[in-house]
Structures are given as structure tokens and as C-alpha cells.
């Protein structure tokens, strides 16, 4: 069960409720574990993880990425700008996580867990950011057409897209985790 779900909070006796910071930290680490499992299947199934042709597939993708201006790196750190970027980025990743849902055979449940846990993480972070400026949500129509476009790709591009989504999501979460520990 992901750490954000209700059953975890009533866990073992003597376990006090998780604090907001601990919840967020545990949730990100849980998702990262899930991504590792999915990457393992992807890399075992194809040679995408060693491929040098990533740029071809990356042209079709607009995956969220941390940049200096987002304020999440040690250099130029800005906690409020950064938190908004983390939430916005996670919301933008949701369509790509939806795409992943039919891309795994033995790890189908893991892909679902990553998707659901990310939704829970977004909720935790939105609570933390309650005093910050409104966060823009991706347009559902744009997301729907992106999903259709990704699903219409040939097999090689779909495999490469899966690999790139997992790699980018992992990098985004790792940067987020480092920054959130300061907050």
C-alpha cells in the first residue's frame, strides 16, 4: 500500500500519524521505487536503455524538466517558485503516466500504483502550498489529443517514449525530493 493511503495512517500500534513532511518524503521514495521496477521491465524487454536514438522520440514529447529558473536547485533556490514548479510538473506528468498504463505486462499493477501514488503526492503538496499562488492545471482536451498521438506511434517509438517518460519522471522526482527536504 502506498504510504499516502489511509490504511498506512492507522498502521501498527504506537505509530503516530505521519507528519506532512514525512508523508511527502515517503511518498516520493515509494514512487521512485515503483519507477525502478518499471524501468527494470522496460530495459529487460528492449534495448531502449542503451539506445542513442532518444532525440528522435524526444521531439514528440514535452516532458516537464527542472531548469535553473524554477528555483529548485541549490544555486538560485527559491522555495515558493520551486514548490509551484513541482506541483505544476507533476500535474503535467499525469497524462504521461496515463499513457504508461497499457505499456506493461508483468508490472501492470506497479504502473497503476505509480499513477495513483502521484495523485496522492499532488494532494499532499497542494496542502503544503495552500498559501501560494494558484497553480495552473493542464488542459484536458490538450492532454486527450496528446494521449491519442502517443498511442498512435509505431512500436519502436512507443517503447522509446515509455523509457523516456520513466527516466524523466525519475529525474524530476529526485530533484523535487532534494528541494522539498529544505522546505
Amino acid at each position: 500500500v502506498p504510504p499516502g493511503e489511509d490504511s498506512k495512517d492507522v498502521a501498527a500500534p504506537h505509530r503516530q500519524p505521519l507528519t506532512s513532511s514525512e508523508r511527502i518524503d515517503k511518498q516520493i521514495r515509494y514512487i521512485l521505487d515503483g519507477i525502478s521496477a518499471l524501468r527494470k521491465e522496460t530495459c529487460n524487454k528492449s534495448n531502449m536503455c542503451e539506445s542513442s536514438k532518444e532525440a528522435l522520440a524526444e521531439n514528440n514529447l514535452n516532458l516537464p524538466k527542472m531548469a535553473e529558473k524554477d528555483g529548485c536547485f541549490q544555486s538560485g533556490f527559491n522555495e515558493e517558485t520551486c514548490l509551484v514548479k513541482i506541483i505544476t510538473g507533476l500535474l503535467e506528468f499525469e497524462v504521461y503516466l496515463e499513457y504508461l498504463q497499457n505499456r506493461f505486462e508483468s508490472s501492470e499493477e506497479q504502473a497503476r500504483a505509480v499513477q495513483m501514488s502521484t495523485k496522492v503526492l499532488i494532494q499532499f503538496l497542494q496542502k503544503k502550498a495552500k498559501n501560494l499562488d494558484a497553480i495552473t492545471t493542464p488542459d484536458p482536451t490538450t492532454n486527450a489529443s496528446l494521449l491519442t498521438k502517443l498511442q498512435a506511434q509505431n512500436q519502436w517509438l512507443q517503447d522509446m517514449t515509455t523509457h523516456l517518460i520513466l527516466r524523466s519522471f525519475k529525474e524530476f522526482l529526485q530533484s523535487s525530493l532534494r528541494a522539498l527536504r529544505q522546505m
Epitope: 505509530r15 514525512e22 518524503d25 522555495e79 529544505q182 522546505m183
Partner: antibody, heavy 119, light 106 residues
């Protein structure tokens, strides 16, 4: 040299107030969260409070919540601990500590400043 | 709050000895740290995130463990290692510390 220097400690009566300062030098102050940790004479360490790098989030131990306030002046690379309604049990050496970037470890500590609460 | 219990509270050892200090948590913790403190000085970070050696710390120090049980090991005690050692955990706020283990010269 990376350094934290605390000041502002001293003798104060129960119910009184004191403001501690922690001046940082040798590193860029702005990206780091800071904490205060105290140590009563001859006793162990007790975490008191944390502030995020921009001051948006503060955390306090139950023993000081409502009495102590942690703040920052990033232009001066200085952290402050405003201590009100002081009690005898607040008597301790107060250390400020920097939180390691990307981790929860407290990696750089000041030399400490002694606060004595007594009538 | 999470309680940390260190054992032993104090120990006597000789230079060159292998020293092991344990830290037991009341419930599973997310991150564990070890500090060294000498009289009249500030604590010094030795180990972070269970087993990572802090910058400038000699390799004779090592940390291990997970869940509720953690260990600090000094493989070959040196004269400068006589001090008090504290474990500290973070699993959300507050951070909590063990009561300390004093390592004295035999």
C-alpha cells in the same frame, strides 16, 4: 571557511525574553534550511526548531511551540530565535545548525551560546 | 515522538579497539545520523542517511542498519575518537536524539 556564529545568550529571569542570532559566513546562505538545537548543562541534545530557506515554513518542538519564533534576514545571512516566556528548563547551550542541501542531516554547527533562565 | 535508545551509555576502550554503538528506535525511522561531540564543543556530523560518511570524516567510522536498529562502528579507535556519540533520527518533525554514548580511555 564555512562558519555559524551564535550570539545573544545570557542570564534572564523566568518569564523574560531573549533573542538569539546566528550569523553565517563562508557559504551562500539563501538555499539552506536552518535549525536550532539545545543542550541543557550535562545533558543530551534536543532539537528546537527549523526554518525553510525563505522562511515560508517553520517547525517547532512541542516544548517551545507558541513561545519561540524562528526568523531569517537573508540580506544579513542571519537567523534569529526569539524566545519569550522563558522557563528554568529552557536553560541550555543553544546551537544553530545548517541543514545539508538535499538531505535532512544537520551538517554545520555553530559553537553555541549559553542561555540561563534563573531568578 | 520517536524515542532513540543508545547502548551502551558509556564504554571504556583502548586505542586500536573496534567499537560498536547501537541505537534502537521506538518505531521504524526514515533517516538516521550519527554525531560526535567533545566537551565544550559543538556536535560534528559523522554519518548521514544511515551509512553515508560525512565530508572529512575518517573511513574508520561506518554506519549501518535500517528500520529500528542502527549501529555506529569505529574499526580502530584513535586517541582523538574519545568523545560522546549521539544518534539522531528524522521521520518528520521533531528530530530526536539518543541519550548519548560516552567513549572513554581504558
Amino acid at each position: 571557511e564555512v562558519q555559524l556564529v551564535e550570539s545573544g545568550g545570557g542570564l534572564v529571569q523566568p518569564g523574560g525574553s531573549l533573542r538569539l542570532s546566528c550569523a553565517a559566513s563562508g557559504f551562500t546562505f539563501s538555499p539552506f534550511a536552518m535549525s536550532w538545537v539545545r543542550q541543557a548543562p550535562g545533558k543530551g541534545l534536543e532539537w528546537v526548531a527549523k526554518i525553510s530557506p525563505g522562511g515560508s515554513w517553520t517547525y517547532y518542538s512541542d516544548t517551545v511551540t507558541g513561545r519561540f519564533t524562528f526568523s531569517l534576514d537573508t540580506s544579513k545571512s542571519t537567523a534569529y530565535l526569539q524566545m519569550n516566556s522563558l522557563r528554568a528548563e529552557d536553560t541550555a547551550v543553544y546551537y544553530c545548525a545548517r541543514q545539508k542541501w538535499g538531505y535532512y542531516a544537520l551538517d554545520i554547527w555553530g559553537q553555541g551560546t549559553l542561555v540561563t533562565v534563573s531568578s | 515522538d520517536i524515542q532513540l535508545t543508545q547502548s551502551p551509555s558509556s564504554l571504556s576502550a583502548s586505542v586500536g579497539d573496534r567499537v560498536t554503538i547501537t541505537c534502537s528506535a521506538s518505531i521504524s525511522v526514515s533517516y538516521m545520523y550519527w554525531y560526535q561531540q567533545k566537551p565544550g564543543k559543538a556536535p560534528k556530523l559523522l554519518i548521514y542517511d544511515m551509512s553515508n560518511l560525512a565530508s572529512g570524516v575518517p573511513s574508520r567510522f561506518s554506519g549501518s542498519g535500517s528500520g529500528t536498529d542502527f549501529t555506529l562502528t569505529i574499526s580502530s579507535l584513535q586517541p582523538e575518537d574519545f568523545a560522546t556519540y549521539y544518534c539522531m533520527q528524522w521521520s518528520g518533525y521533531p528530530y530526536t536524539f539518543g541519550q548519548g554514548t560516552k567513549v572513554e580511555i581504558k
